[in-house]
Amino acid sequence: VPRWRQQWSGPGTTKRFPETVLARCVKYTEIHPEMRHVDCQSVWDAFKGAFISKHPCNITEEDYQPLMKLGTQTVPCNKILLWSRIKDLAHQFTQVQRDMFTLEDTLLGYLADDLTWCGEFNTSKINYQSCPDWRKDCSNNPVSVFWKTVSRRFAEAACDVVHVMLNGSRSKIFDKNSTFGSVEVHNLQPEKVQTLEAWVIHGGREDSRDLCQDPTIKELESIISKRNIQFSCKNIYRPDKFLQCVKNPEDSSCTSEI
């Protein structure tokens, strides 16, 4: 008789999840010499240990600590690019501006980017049918807790001028319920971070509005200023200049060093 399985509202674990994580780890450590010491099998074991046999609505940051320890990585703290609701463009930017880093350019972020995973209480099985949805089911699910944990650590590591790329085409340019708004903003360290500079990316080619005057940007400025961090906002037009670079990242037009 098949055992009853909890039906969650979200999609199930990404197919071939263990193989994907392991393969990504191997690829990352080959490309990044500073991470060559990492044992990818141990990384997978630690990742698996964070959620396997645990109730997928009962995951804690502590569950991920062994993985965090194995994935410890130093990125230049003054070259951090955060993003909200504009992931692809942010990644295209760091793809060509090689000295800046998003969370997904780090090992742990790279491993989990665009993946879903969860297990089941008291069984060693991975649930490929469904996983908890953050809104409809529970917030302490494996995926949400993972991103909250790594995002917090990433923000805590930042220093000097931190950039954040925001989507000027959205109704809420700054959304305090996003990972950036709920986690990263509150974990920037005022004693290390001098300025948060927001890049508001405009979508339309004829758009000449000043989106830095948007009420949600004023809200972000207020939050940041109260944390004794300076705030700066820049309108960024012509994002097609980034996209052009993606086709030919080695091109000299794809670096801000003039």
């Epitope: 509005r209 005057q213 309108n235 037009y237």
Partner: antibody, heavy 120, light 107 residues
Framework: QVQLVESGGGLVQPGGSLRLSCAAS????????MNWVRQAPGKGLEWVSA????????YYADSVKGRFTISRDNSKNTLYLQMNSLRAEDTAVYYC?????????????WGQGTLVTVSS | DIELTQPPSVSVAPGQTARISCSGD??????VYWYQQKPGQAPVLVIY???KRPSGIPERFSGSNSGNTATLTISGTQAEDEADYYC??????????FGGGTKLTVL
């Protein structure tokens, strides 16, 4: 090193036409937005027009919209400015300028300019 | 469209600090660029992105941008710095604007 060389300037009567060219070398021309900027004698700089790296997006200052056309031939590493219905106030040195990369929109390199004189 | 206002002229003694201002509504929300132009020559970019120096530009050139005003600062001004200086910004679409220019005289 980056080189931009303008040509095609000269004396033209009001209402006449002229086509400026800018030959680019020393960089991957097809990767950059390119611009025309002009400077009337004894006056300041005025941006005229811009074109995206592959030529599919163009921008014009209000003062030239409908009269000037910017284009490029990436196979020839050349930028053009077709100027029609010329007026006395179009008299200026016309500079070809290469855009800055990524989040920046300014001019990293300039040509030496070509003088356009509109007079009867 | 934003309008950029610069003082027509600024004078400075050699070795002193010259400051050239450029003002416009909410200018802090846009990156500002500065160009140096000597008589009969094409402009040269000296500052981009508010405060970044292109390679080959001396360290004495610096820039800042806050409030409604961007400032080009030349510390330890030299005779060779005598030139016209233009600020520029881009506010989207076809709104790329220059300031009117400032003539820097080194006394």
């Amino acid at each position: 090193q980056v080189q931009l060389v303008e040509s095609g300037g000269g004396l033209v009567q009001p209402g006449g036409s002229l086509r400026l060219s800018c030959a680019a070398s020393g960089f991957t021309f097809s990767s950059y937005y390119m611009n025309w900027v002009r400077q009337a004698p004894g006056k300041g700089l005025e941006w005229v027009s811009a074109i995206s790296s592959n030529g599919d997006i163009t921008y014009y200052a209000d003062s030239v919209k409908g009269r000037f056309t910017i284009s490029r031939d990436n196979s020839k590493n050349t930028l053009y400015l077709q100027m029609n219905s010329l007026r006395a106030e179009d008299t200026a040195v016309y500079y070809c300028a290469r855009d800055l990369p990524l989040v920046y929109t300014g001019f990293a390199y300039w040509g030496q300019g070509t003088l356009v004189t509109v007079s009867s | 469209d934003i309008e950029l206002t610069q003082p027509p002229s600024v004078s400075v003694a050699p070795g002193q600090t010259a400051r050239i201002s450029c003002s416009g509504d909410n200018l802090r929300h846009y990156y500002v660029y500065w160009y140096q132009q000597k008589p009969g020559q094409a402009p040269v970019l000296v500052i981009y992105g508010d405060s970044k120096r292109p390679s080959g530009i001396p360290e004495r050139f610096s820039g800042s941008n806050s409030g409604n005003t961007a400032t080009l600062t030349i510390s330890g001004t030299q005779a060779e710095d005598e030139a016209d200086y233009y600020c520029q910004t881009y506010t989207g679409g076809a709104s790329l604007v220059f300031g009117g220019g400032t003539k820097l005289t080194v006394l």
